[in-house]
Structures are given as C-alpha cells and as structure tokens.
C-alpha cells in the first residue's frame, strides 16, 4: 500500500514530482522540474523563515518598538525571528510580547510572592497573621512582626497585616 503522503516530510508534490522544500533561511524562487531542482534564495536583511518551506516571501523580523516599552532580547537571523522583551520595570502583556505594562505594586497588607520579570507581572499575596507590609512595593515581601519578647519588651499595640506590633517596657510592680 502507498504511504499516506506520497512525498517525504521536507518535500512537496507538484506536477507529479516530489520537490524539495527550501531550507530555513531561504525562500522559494521556482519549483523543481524534471530538469532542475527547487530554486531557493536566502532571505534578505531583517527577514527570516524558520521552517523548511515553499514560501515565496520571507517574513519581516519583529520590530521591538521602544515607544511601547520594548527592547531587543535576541536579534533575529535569517532562520529566527527577533525576540523582544520589556524595559526594566515593565513586563509583556502577552506571550508574543507586542507591548509592555508597568509591573504592579503590592498594596499595604500584601507582600511580593514572586518578583516580576520581563514576561510576567508581580504576584502578590496577603500578609498572613504574624506578618505585615506597610508600603506599596513591587519588591518587598511581608515582614514578620517584631518579637517584643526577644527584646525583653511587651506588646503595647497588636500588629495587623499593615502595621508592625508596638513594643513597650514591661510594667514592673513597685515594691
């Protein structure tokens, strides 16, 4: 029985003949014939094709627009697209990284669980009992309440998720 595809993976069928696809980095100029092989040409500057193909035009490299907060993370080649990332303090809005937004800050009462990267936003978490955050920050974690006992002090004012405990001297009974 015939295989499901008459030609091999890096070939295509045209005019009852299996022609070679063009290798990555090259575009199709003319199909093969009985007398000639497939004719391919390298992609131009700022163009690429990343697969074996029969494209007659190469794709343009992605432009990392600084007005959208983008910068080049990896320069494109004839076989790969340019990879964009965001400027410091910003992150991509999508996997394709077509624009950037400012990293979010964690409000008081919340701490940073995971610091933002060029491709992911800050992840905040509520400060659990025994911890607090009194600032809006993209870097600060929840801090533990001060331990009055270790300073030989007592709690004068209880801590919250936004404030530290207030310690004071112990009330000593007069003799």
């Amino acid at each position: 029985p015939e295989p499901p595809t008459a030609c091999r993976e890096k070939q295509y069928l045209i005019n009852s003949q299996c022609c070679s696809l063009c290798q990555p980095g090259q575009k199709l100029v003319s199909d093969c014939t009985e007398f000639t092989e497939t004719e391919c040409l390298p992609c131009g500057e700022s163009e690429f094709l990343d697969t074996w193909n029969r494209e007659t035009h190469c794709h343009q490299h992605k432009y990392c627009d600084p007005n959208l907060g983008l910068r080049v993370q990896q320069k494109g080649t004839s076989e790969t697209d340019t990879i964009c990332t965001c400027e410091e303090g910003w992150h991509c809005t999508s996997e394709a990284c077509e624009s950037c937004v400012l990293h979010r800050s964690c409000s008081p009462g919340f701490g940073v669980k995971q610091i933002a990267t060029g491709v992911s936003d800050t992840i905040c978490e509520p400060c659990p009992v025994g911890f607090f955050s009194n600032v809006s920050s993209a870097f600060e974690k929840c801090h533990p309440w001060t331990s009055c006992e270790t300073k030989d002090l007592v709690v004068q004012q209880a801590g919250t998720n936004k404030t530290d405990v207030v310690c004071g001297p112990q009330d000593r009974l007069r003799a």
Epitope: E2, P3, A6, C7, R8, K10, Q11, L13, S16, Q17, C18, C19, S20, L21, Q23, C32, E34, F35, E37, T38
Partner: antibody
Framework: EVQLVESGGGLVQPGRSMKLSCAAS????????MAWVRQAPTKGLEWVAT????????YYRDSVKGRFTISRDNAKSTLYLQMNSLRSEDTATYYC???????????WGQGVMVTVSS | DIQMTQSPSSISVSLGDRFTITCRAS??????LNWYQQKPEKSPKLMIY???NLEDGVPSRFSGSRSGSDYSLTINSLESEDTGFYFC?????????FGSGTKLEIK
Amino acid sequence: EVQLVESGGGLVQPGRSMKLSCAASGFTFSYFPMAWVRQAPTKGLEWVATISTSGGNIYYRDSVKGRFTISRDNAKSTLYLQMNSLRSEDTATYYCTRDTAPYYFDYWGQGVMVTVSS
Amino acid sequence: DIQMTQSPSSISVSLGDRFTITCRASQDIGNYLNWYQQKPEKSPKLMIYRATNLEDGVPSRFSGSRSGSDYSLTINSLESEDTGFYFCVQHKQYPLTFGSGTKLEIK
C-alpha cells in the same frame, strides 16, 4: 515500507551485455528520480547514473557513457540498467537508490553482484 | 570533477568516546553533502543530509557540521552498534562523488 529489490546480476564475460532491474514498492515510484551506484570489491562507492521522474533527463559517469543505459518503467515501478561492452573494471555490487532532494540516496536496495571475468 | 577527501581512513575508538570524521571538498558544494553508514554485507544507510540534518530514526548522538569546505560527522558517545564504514557524498553537481570512506572499529 519503501523497498528496492535488484536482480539480474551474475558472471559475464568481458565485452558482453547484462541488464539489471530494480523493483520498487512502498512509494509512488513515478514521483522520484532514481540512480544506480556501484561498489567494487576493493574500491569505494561510485555513482553510475541518475534518471529523472519520467526519464527525460539522464546523467552518466564518464567511464560508462555510451556503454550503459539507465531507464525506467513507471507503470511497473521498475528501474533498469542496461550494461553493454562490459569491462573487468565494471565488476562491483550495483545498488539501486532514490535520488531525491533534499535527501538524495535515502533508500537503497540490497545490491546485486556483477562479475566481469573471462 | 569535485574531489571529496575523507579522513581518517580508519579509526579505533573506545565505547562512550566522541569522534569526528571529516570530508573536504575540492570546490564549493554549499551544503550539498550527505553522510552514510554501511555495515559489512549491508546496503548504505543515510545518516545526515544537507550537511547538518539528521535523517529520521538516526540517534541524536550523530551530528553533522560544516566549516568552509570541511564537513564533519561527529558521534558524541560511541555505542557498539556504531561500528562500520562511513562515507560522504557530494550532491552539488554531476558526477556525484564519494569520499573514500572511514572504517570505524571499537578499541
């Protein structure tokens, strides 16, 4: 499964003729250029001839030009090599192979021995 | 005709070792070079096509590379099944020409 099976080899005297056949199966024979390659007992491999899909384009190595004829019958999925005026230096195992870009020589037959000797 | 100069002609390698075979083309052949493996009394088997592309089913320890007119076949960690005869072929122009081959043995 792609299969190429050569036949027609054997012992032949110098100056005589012999015809090799290669029966192809497991692929659409007419879509692929084909070739013959040989391997002498004490020497390396040598390309002999290539034929295009419908036989309109044929190439030979210089030493066999005018003596050997490559042909194909797409209806029978068979490749042929007609060898005339055989010489002792034609003694070799002859392989039938697909000559298809970008892979070239991607599948080979098991080979058939041709011995030219008096 | 394009001459393909292959080296070494034979090599003895220990299991697990890395080794490289080279073919040098006498004129420009672009990436039109294939590598084949042949076992005794068997037909050749395509390993690498267009200088760097691994044929389906060939273990990833095999790789092909090009530096100018020098083409290399490398086996990263030799296994016992890798013994045999290796040769290159240029497919850039007729007559298609072969390297003289390299016999690979286990030390």
